[in-house]
C-alpha cells in the first residue's frame, strides 16, 4: 500500500481542501473511526487500484487517524493497513470531543492506559492534572494519542493554552474493577417441574475469564451423568455460564443442585445451590383461609384477596351468583391475578364504590389440566345506620309516646336515653337509659323488618312515657357495626300548652328564662 503524501503525520490548514491518494495491488479503501469515507475508487491499466479522498473545508474536528486498507481486509497482515494522522490546527476547537466510552476508563489490573485527550495543533503544550487540581502530573504526552501511564482510581483533566485562554478537557474517570473474587449465581428456568418436563439450570460467573465448573445433582449420585454446556454471554464481558439440562425429569430428580466454580490463577472458589422439586402432577392449593361471610361497606371500595399455590400456571375465574365476572368497563369491578413468586399467586376482586346489588354469593375458581380448587363466600354489604324519623305524640290515654324509625345493615341496635335536667345533661350528668327497667315509667316496643330489595333492616321502636312532669330530652340512638346515628326530641308535660311557644323555667334551662318554639323542641339531630 502506498499513501500520497506519505505522512505519517500531516499538518493542514483550517478551511483548506486536501487530496489523499492510496494505491495497492487490490481494491483499497479509506476509513476513519471504522467507517468508510466518501471517496473515488479507480483501477489503472497496470492492474493497480487506487482511492482518492478529498477533504474539503477542513476544521479542527477533522483531526485524527485515517487508514487505508484493502477492501477485503480479512486475513491481511498488519503492514497491509497504512495509518496517517492529520492535524488541522483550529483555535476554535479546544480538545477533540470524546464519547462516553473514552471518558470512563475501566481497568481490571494494574496496567498502562491512555487518557485520550487530543488537541488539533501538535505545537500546543498539554498538561495533565487531577480534576480540580493545579499541579501538572509528570506523565508523557503524545499529541496523537494522549497521556499514557499507570493511573490511580481518580478523575483527571487535561489543560492547554490556545492564544491567551486556558482550555480544559472533559474529565476522565479511571476506575479499577475487582476481578479476583469469584461470585457465582445459580438459577433455574423453573424450580418446580412435573415428571416428564425438562429441568434447566444456569450457573453464571462474572468477572473471571478462566474458570472450571462442577455440578452436583441427584442423578450424579446414582451414576447417571449429564454433560453441562458452557458458553460466554457475548454482550457481557467475562460472564461465563454453565447450563445443566436434564430432559424428561423423574421424581428421583428432586433435590439439591449445586454449582461449584474454581479459578486456577488465584485458586479461588465459590459454590451456590438451588432446590428442584419434581411433582407427579400439577397442583392448586389454597393458602390461608377466607371466611364464609365477608363484609363490604356501602359506597366504599373493597378488595377480596385469595392466595394460592399452583403449578403449572392456572386459569383463574371469578363468579357472582354463578355468573362469570370480568373487569367492568365502568370501572366498578377490577379483577387481577398476580404471580408473586414462581408458584404462588394472589387473585384479587376489587369492588369499587360498593353497591347494594353487589351483595351475593362469590366464587373464585383456579384450575389447570391437572387440578382445580374453588373458594366461595357470601358478601354482605354493610350500610351505616340512619335515623329516619323521631316523632312525639300524646294520645288521649294520657301517656306520651316517642317513635323512632331507622335503617341499616347489619341490624341496628336501638338505645333510648333521656335527660331530665336540661341544664346539666348531657355534659355533667350521663343520660339515663330508658326501656330496659321493670319500672312502669316507660315501656318499649320494637319491631324489626328486613327489606329484601334494599338488603337492609328497618327498626321501628315506640317508647311510651307514663307521666312527664317536666321537660325531658329523649334521645334515640341507633348503632350497628359500621356506624351510629342519633336524634333528640324534647318532650314537654301535658300541662304546658303545646301548639304555642312554651315557657320553660330558668330552673329547667339553667340560668335564664327562655322561650323555646316547637321547632326548637323537636329537631335536635346528631350524627
Amino acid at each position: 500500500l502506498v499513501i500520497t503524501p506519505p505522512g505519517p503525520e500531516l499538518i493542514l490548514n483550517v478551511s483548506s481542501t486536501f487530496v489523499l491518494t492510496c494505491s495497492g495491488s487490490a481494491p483499497v479503501v479509506w476509513e476513519r473511526m471504522s467507517q468508510e469515507l466518501p471517496q473515488e475508487m479507480a483501477k489503472a491499466q497496470d492492474n493497480t487500484f487506487s482511492s482518492v479522498l478529498t477533504l474539503t473545508n477542513l476544521t479542527g474536528l477533522d483531526t485524527g487517524e485515517y487508514f487505508c486498507t484493502y477492501n477485503d481486509s480479512r486475513g491481511l497482515e498488519p503492514d497491509e493497513r497504512k495509518r496517517l494522522y492529520i492535524f488541522v490546527p483550529d483555535p476554535t476547537v479546544g480538545f477533540l470531543p470524546n464519547d462516553a466510552e473514552e471518558l470512563f476508563i475501566f481497568l481490571t489490573e494494574i496496567t498502562e492506559i491512555t487518557i485520550p485527550c487530543r488537541v488539533t495543533d501538535p505545537q500546543l503544550v498539554v498538561t495533565l492534572h487531577e480534576k480540580k487540581g493545579d499541579i501538572a502530573l509528570p506523565v508523557p504526552y503524545d499529541h496523537q494519542r494522549g497521556f499514557s501511564g499507570i493511573f490511580e482510581d481518580r478523575s483527571y483533566i487535561c489543560k492547554t493554552t490556545i492564544g491567551d485562554r486556558e482550555v480544559d478537557s472533559d474529565a476522565y474517570y479511571v476506575y479499577r474493577l475487582q476481578v479476583s473474587s469469584i461470585n457465582v449465581s445459580v438459577n433455574a428456568v423453573q424450580t418446580v417441574v412435573r415428571q416428564g418436563e425438562n429441568i434447566t439450570l444456569m450457573c453464571i460467573v462474572i468477572g473471571n475469564e478462566v474458570v472450571n465448573f462442577e455440578w452436583m445433582y441427584p442423578r450424579k449420585e446414582s451414576g447417571r451423568l449429564v454433560e453441562p454446556v458452557t458458553d460466554f454471554l457475548l454482550d457481557m464481558p467475562y460472564h461465563i455460564r454453565s447450563i445443566l439440562h436434564i430432559p424428561s425429569a423423574e421424581l428421583e430428580d428432586s433435590g439439591t443442585y449445586t454449582c461449584n466454580v474454581t479459578e486456577s490463577v488465584n485458586d479461588h472458589q465459590d459454590e451456590k445451590a438451588i432446590n428442584i422439586t419434581v411433582v407427579e402432577s400439577g397442583y392448586v392449593r389454597l393458602l390461608g383461609e377466607v371466611g364464609a361471610l365477608q363484609f363490604a361497606e356501602l359506597h366504599r371500595s373493597r378488595t377480596l384477596q385469595v392466595v394460592f399455590e399452583a403449578y403449572p400456571p392456572p386459569t383463574v375465574l371469578w363468579f357472582k351468583d354463578n355468573r362469570t365476572l370480568g373487569d367492568s368497563s365502568a370501572g366498578e369491578i377490577a379483577l387481577s391475578t398476580r404471580n408473586v413468586s414462581e408458584t404462588r399467586y394472589v387473585s384479587e376482586l376489587t369492588l369499587v364504590r360498593v353497591k347494594v346489588a353487589e351483595a351475593g354469593h362469590y366464587t373464585m375458581r383456579a384450575f389447570h389440566e391437572d387440578a382445580e380448587v374453588q373458594l366461595s363466600f357470601q358478601l354482605q354489604i354493610n350500610v351505616p345506620v340512619r335515623v329516619l324519623e323521631l316523632s312525639e305524640s300524646h294520645p288521649d290515654s294520657g301517656e306520651q309516646t316517642v317513635r323512632c324509625r331507622g335503617r341499616g345493615m347489619p341490624q341496628p341496635n336501638i338505645i333510648w336515653s333521656a335527660c331530665r335536667d336540661l341544664k346539666r345533661c348531657p355534659r355533667e350528668l350521663p343520660p339515663m337509659l330508658l326501656g330496659n327497667s321493670s319500672e312502669e315509667e316507660s315501656q318499649l316496643e320494637t319491631n324489626v323488618t328486613y327489606w329484601e330489595e334494599e338488603q337492609e333492616f328497618e327498626v321501628v321502636s315506640t317508647l311510651r312515657l307514663q307521666h312527664v312532669d317536666r321537660p325531658l330530652s329523649v334521645r334515640c340512638t341507633l348503632r350497628n357495626a359500621v356506624g351510629q346515628d342519633m336524634q333528640e326530641v324534647i318532650v314537654v308535660p301535658h300541662s304546658l300548652p303545646f301548639k304555642e311557644q312554651k315557657l320553660i323555667s330558668e330552673e329547667d334551662l339553667g340560668g335564664e328564662q327562655k322561650l323555646i318554639s316547637e321547632e326548637d323542641l323537636h329537631h335536635h339531630h346528631h350524627h
Epitope: 470524546n98 462516553a100 470512563f104 457481557m236 467475562y238 460472564h239
Partner: antibody, heavy 127, light 107 residues
C-alpha cells in the same frame, strides 16, 4: 469553564405549559447523561428525570409521567424540559445537572454522581 | 420504590466539631449512594459518590461510609463554610431518589 445555565422559568397558570432550557458549555455535552432536579420552596431536592447521551433512554419520577417530557439537542448543546398540564405542586426551582453514568460493565452499572449543576430557574404555578 | 431517610433533620454544631449524618435506605442498595451539600440560595454540590469516593476538589474532612441500607457522611472538623443542608441520593439504572435533607446550623 464547565457551565450549565437554565432559562425559561416564570409564572404559569395551573393546566398551562412551559418549556425550560438548559445551555451547556465547557464540556462535550453529547457524551453525558443529563438530569433535571427540582426544589419546592423550603423543601428538599426531588429528581424529576434524566436522559441519556443520544436521547434514546429517558426516565422520570412518577408524579410527572405523562405531563413532562425531557429532550435534548446535542447540536445546540441544550437540554429541555417541556412541562404540560402543570399543577400548583410543580412550583419549584428547577436545576439541570450533568449525570455521570459510565457505560455498563456487563450487568454492572456505576455512577459518579451529578457533578455539575446550573443555578436554577424558578417556575411558579398559580392562578 | 426505595425510600431514603436521613437523620437527624437538623443538627446544631460548632466550628471544629465532628459531625455525623446518617442515611437509611428502605432496602439494600449496595453502595449506590451519593452525598450533596447545598448552601442557602445556591445549587447543590457533589461531595461523595459510590458511598465513599470523594469527589475531586472536595476537602478531605468529608468522608462517606456504609453499604447495604445504612450510610454515614462524616465531617471531620466542621468549618464555617460547612453550615449547609446535606442530602443523600440513591441511584439505580432508571431513577434517582434524594433523602429529605439534614440542615447543619450554628449552635
Amino acid at each position: 469553564e464547565v457551565q450549565l445555565v437554565e432559562s425559561g422559568g416564570g409564572l404559569v397558570q395551573p393546566g398551562g405549559s412551559l418549556r425550560l432550557s438548559c445551555g451547556a458549555s465547557g464540556f462535550t455535552f453529547s457524551s453525558y447523561w443529563m438530569t433535571w432536579v427540582r426544589q419546592a420552596p423550603g423543601k428538599g431536592l426531588e429528581w424529576v428525570g434524566n436522559i441519556n447521551q443520544d436521547g434514546s433512554e429517558k426516565y422520570s419520577v412518577d408524579s410527572v409521567k405523562g405531563r413532562f417530557t425531557i429532550s435534548r439537542d446535542n447540536a445546540k448543546n441544550s437540554l429541555y424540559l417541556q412541562m404540560n398540564r402543570v399543577r400548583a405542586e410543580d412550583t419549584a426551582v428547577y436545576y439541570c445537572s450533568r449525570d455521570l453514568v459510565p457505560p455498563r460493565q456487563g450487568d454492572n452499572y456505576y455512577y459518579f454522581g451529578m457533578d455539575v449543576w446550573g443555578l436554577g430557574t424558578t417556575v411558579t404555578v398559580s392562578s | 420504590d426505595i425510600q431514603m431517610t436521613q437523620s437527624p433533620s437538623t443538627l446544631s454544631a460548632s466550628v471544629g466539631d465532628r459531625v455525623i449524618i446518617t442515611c437509611r435506605a428502605s432496602q439494600n442498595i449496595n453502595n449506590w449512594l451519593a452525598w450533596y451539600q447545598q448552601q442557602p440560595g445556591k445549587a447543590p454540590k457533589l461531595l461523595i459518590y459510590e458511598a465513599s469516593s470523594l469527589e475531586s476538589g472536595v476537602p478531605s474532612r468529608f468522608s462517606g461510609s456504609g453499604s447495604g441500607t445504612e450510610f454515614t457522611l462524616t465531617i471531620g472538623s466542621l468549618q464555617p463554610d460547612d453550615f449547609a443542608t446535606y442530602y443523600c441520593q440513591h441511584y439505580n439504572s432508571y431513577s434517582r431518589t434524594f433523602g429529605q435533607g439534614t440542615k447543619v446550623d450554628i449552635k
